[in-house]
């Protein structure tokens, strides 16, 4: 009962938490302009991974969408890579874990096999949170670089003629909501391992016993009856979640540095 | 006291290129505003050329101006206009004009700077 | 590009009347229209933007109303000060493609 809840909570969280990053990844909030300095403004700017917004003390909002592909900062392209694998791993892991769920019958699958895909899309679903981690706080640690930078160029240039606040930007809505998203996914794909080692059949330790037949001299084992958890000495089953590891390590394999332009 | 301040007008040939700058001071472009180029010919009324929002940098022109006429934001105080393949219909005094919003209209304007052409 | 049609192309009133000029958008601009005043030899002056909000230092005497496709500019109790061109024009809308088209202008001679 514990693991069927524990399983269950693990897939709605992840599935909040897969929901927020899409969210995450469509909102235009990702950079807002800061107003300490000019609160008072015609003109509000905030821009996301897909397109700059601004927003008029009229109301009126207009946006345009990053036409160009190639002309767009390196790190930018990251984060949208990043979100995406995300989306995409956690998507998956979804489908597979609804497959998983032992509330549901699904003919004749055995607990094994329900144990495997519970471990697979709970590796999913922590991949998915932290590439979303990773993605957001790309994105933050690139804003607080060029918010300084802003900082220490505002009265520059100018010769101190004019005192002019340069438009800086800070965290929008998105950031907090990725975060939260992540985090998210990633504490339901915990849980969705944690229940995979209940779901999994407990193996029965018998003695080893010897049966001498006349003629013959044959040695039961008991490992022969393990059952295929991938606790066990079960070579196929580790395979498949070396196969889940390797998986892992190219969602991750991305360029290590990221010029920004 | 904020200004704006055209240069780069004056007598040309048709078919020959021109750019005019518009320099601010007492503010600077690197705060969101539109500034946008618009033209008037000796005794016509105005012309709407082209208009650029300096927060990202937007364009956007006028039909009749697409692919002869470049506005862009060349530092934190100047936008210029790039002018080519001019003909005598082109006779006119250009002004910048800086709005706070696009709702808010034009409420600061540069004396102008007069372009002539002719052969 | 949107097209503003302004009339009438000229007026003439005497002093303390009251003028109106009307300005048709060729399509719904949403009360995003501003009206300039231009004196001979000077650049324009913001009278009125958003269709009716008076700019700063702007008299009481000129009004704006009106939406959608239709606007007016009134001038109540006219001054010698009033003769000029006016100018309407669309508001400036980038990402959408409105662009920020004038109309033909209205003389206002005062007499």
């Known amino acids: 009962m514990a693991v069927t809840a524990c399983q269950g909570l693990g897939f709605v969280v992840s599935l909040i938490g897969i929901a927020g990053i899409i969210a995450a990844t469509c909102m235009d909030q990702w950079s807002t302009q800061d107003l300490y300095n000019n609160p008072v403004t015609a003109v509000f700017n905030y821009q996301g991974l897909w397109r700059s917004c601004v927003r008029e003390s009229s109301g009126f909002t207009e946006c345009r969408g990053y036409f160009t592909l190639l002309g767009l900062p390196a790190m930018l392209q990251a984060v949208r890579a990043l979100m995406i694998v995300g989306i995409v791993l956690g998507a998956i892991g979804l489908l597979v874990s609804i497959f998983a769920l032992k509330c549901i019958r699904i003919g004749s699958m055995e607990d094994s096999a329900k144990a495997n895909m519970t471990l697979t899309s709970g590796i999913m679903f922590i991949v998915s949170g932290l590439c979303a981690i990773a993605g957001v706080s790309v994105f933050a640690n690139m804003l607080v670089t060029n918010f300084w930078m802003s900082t220490a160029n505002m009265y520059t240039g100018m010769g101190g003629m004019v005192q002019t606040v340069q438009t800086r930007y800070t965290f929008g809505a998105a950031l907090f909501v990725g975060w939260v998203a992540g985090g998210l996914t990633l504490i339901g794909g915990v849980m969705m391992c944690i229940a995979c080692r209940g779901l999994a059949p407990e193996e029965t330790n018998y003695k080893a016993v010897s049966y001498h037949a006349s003629g013959h001299s044959v040695a039961y084992k008991p490992g022969g009856f393990k059952a295929s958890t991938g606790f066990g000495s079960n070579t196929k089953n580790k395979k498949i979640y070396d196969g889940g590891a390797r998986t892992e390590d190219e969602v991750q394999s991305y360029p290590s540095k990221h010029d920004y332009v | 006291q904020e200004q704006l301040e055209e240069s780069g007008g004056g007598l040309v040939k048709p078919g020959a290129s021109l750019t005019l700058t518009c320099t601010a001071s007492g503010f600077s472009f690197s705060n969101n505003y539109y500034i946008s180029w618009v033209r008037q010919a000796p005794g016509k009324g105005l012309e709407w050329i082209a208009c650029?929002?300096?927060?990202?940098?937007?364009t956007y022109y006028a039909s009749w101006a697409k692919g002869r006429f470049t506005i862009s934001k060349t530092s934190s105080t100047t936008v210029t206009l790039q002018m080519t393949s001019l003909t005598v219909a082109d006779t006119a005094t250009y002004f910048c004009?800086?709005?706070?919003?696009?709702?808010?209209?034009?409420?600061?304007w540069g004396p102008g700077t007069l372009v002539t052409v002719s052969s | 590009d949107v097209v503003m049609t302004q009339t009438p192309a000229s007026v003439s009133e005497p002093v303390g009347g009251t003028v109106t000029i009307k300005c048709q958008a060729s399509?719904?601009?949403?009360?995003?229209l501003a009206w300039y005043q231009q004196k001979p030899g000077q650049p324009p002056k913001l009278l009125i933007y958003g269709a009716s909000t008076l700019a700063s230092g702007v008299p009481s005497r000129f009004k704006g109303s009106g939406s959608g496709t239709e606007y007016t500019l009134t001038i109540s109790g006219v001054q010698c000060a009033d003769a000029a061109t006016y100018y309407c024009q669309c508001s400036v809308t980038i990402s959408t493609g409105v662009g920020g088209a004038f109309g033909g202008g209205t003389k206002v001679v005062v007499v």
């Open positions: 650029i929002y300096t927060g990202y940098s937007w």
């Open positions: 004009a800086r709005a706070d919003s696009g709702y808010s209209g034009f409420n600061l």
């Open positions: 399509q719904s601009i949403d009360s995003r």
